[in-house]
């Protein structure tokens, strides 16, 4: 049984996969910073965390997935605010009973230390310090991101 | 009640560098788009570039070449380089408070009165 | 680069009557960043929409914008001596910002 929470995230995920395909972006667009091949968005406003999801879907972006430790690190240093929350793209799948990113992947324990418990309508905040577990109900700001497309020469065959 | 209110010399001679700054009063410099836009005389507005968190900028491509602008949280201000100019640079200089695309304010939702920067020699 | 055509150019009325102002833009502007401003001379132009539809901090409910895609409009329902101005759309969504050329409305 998938909560209210992973059906949201399935569902524009599943309509963002139907999107045709769109030319590799070369550059982050205006207002969107550039954190090595990510163009990342910090919002302004607060929402829950599927309204942060949706918003993210309507600007052709996903809720922010982090790969690594030192990813996080470096996205935690363009947070300016010590106290203030963003959501990324991770929320606890009950059906699973792990930490799932929302691109279906599941979380790698020693990715990010966790502060909060793991449990039903619990999502993933960031904050300029620590990573915690919080009720996806909550109305705090998000990160949206887009993919840069790596720029690879071209080989052509000799004619 | 945020207020912007720009700085800096109203005559410029040609091929020297235009240099204003706009203090921020009355709110948090950080987490906004701080943008220049510039008006010549009887003409209409064009957007020239903007700075957030310090180390993120963004211009117009038309002037890219000649433009810095910086911030300075600490002071609560932002300022504009303009290098190289000649008349065409002649404008009301306005500094603006940018919303961006992501927050409860969005485009330029506060101004300053606008300076006049003239450049003749 | 989004070029925005306005029109028209100067609108002549009287107080109390209703304004339409069109801009219309040389691509999509998704997502509707589309914004109008108020200008008065010696001043520094005010928002009034943001949005394309929704109404600034302070702005009169006798503003109301609407349009999407390419095609947008600003309505001044009745207008008050202090709207007599011009009127600048704006996109906000593609590098770079651009500004139509403004429509003027002068007093009739």
């Known amino acids: 049984q998938k909560s209210s929470i992973e059906k949201c995230s399935v569902d524009i995920q599943q309509s963002r996969n139907k999107t045709t395909e769109r030319p590799g972006l070369l550059n982050c667009p205006i207002y969107w910073q550039q954190l090595r091949e990510k163009c990342l968005l910090f919002s302004h406003t607060v929402n829950p965390w599927n309204n942060s999801l949706a918003d993210c879907s309507t600007k052709e972006s996903s809720l922010l997935l982090i790969r690594d430790k030192d990813e996080l690190i470096h996205t935690q240093n363009l947070i300016r605010d010590k106290a203030i929350l963003f959501w990324i793209g991770l929320n606890f799948s009950l059906s699973e009973k792990n930490w799932k990113w929302i691109n279906g992947s599941f979380l790698n324990s020693n990715d990010l230390e966790i502060r909060g418990d793991a449990k039903e309508n619990s999502c993933i905040s960031i904050s300029q310090t620590s990573v915690y577990s919080e009720y996806c109900s909550t109305e705090i700001r998000w990160i949206c991101q887009k993919e840069l497309t790596p720029v690879r020469n071209k080989v052509y065959p000799d004619s | 009640q945020v207020h912007l209110q720009e700085s800096g010399p109203g005559l410029v001679k040609p091929s020297e560098t235009l240099s204003l700054t706009c203090t921020v009063s009355?709110?948090?410099?950080?987490?906004?788009?701080w943008s220049w836009i510039r008006q010549p005389p009887g003409k209409g507005l064009e957007w020239i570039g903007y700075v957030y968190n310090s180390e993120s900028t963004y211009y117009n491509p038309s002037l890219k070449s000649r433009v810095t602008i910086s911030e300075d949280t600490s002071k609560s201000q932002f300022s504009l380089k303009l290098s190289s100019v000649t008349a065409a640079d002649t404008a009301v200089y306005y500094c603006a408070r940018d919303g961006g695309i992501v927050g409860l304010t969005a485009a330029f939702d506060i101004w300053g009165q606008g300076t006049m920067v003239t450049v003749s020699s | 680069e989004i070029v925005l055509t306005q029109s028209p150019g100067t609108l002549s009325l009287s107080p109390g009557e209703r304004a339409t102002l069109s801009c219309r833009a040389s691509q999509s502007v998704s997502s509707n960043y589309l914004a109008w401003y108020q200008q008065k001379p010696g001043q520094a132009p005010r928002l009034l929409i943001y949005g394309a539809s929704s109404r600034a901090t302070g702005i009169p409910d006798r503003f109301s914008g609407n349009g999407s895609g390419t095609d947008f409009t600003l309505t001044i329902s009745r207008l008050e001596p202090e709207d007599f101005a011009v009127y600048y759309c704006?996109?906000?969504?593609?590098?770079?910002?651009?500004f139509g050329p403004g429509t003027k409305v002068d007093i009739k």
């Open positions: 704006q996109q906000y969504v593609n590098s770079p910002i651009t």
């Open positions: 009355g709110g948090s410099i950080i987490s906004y788009y």
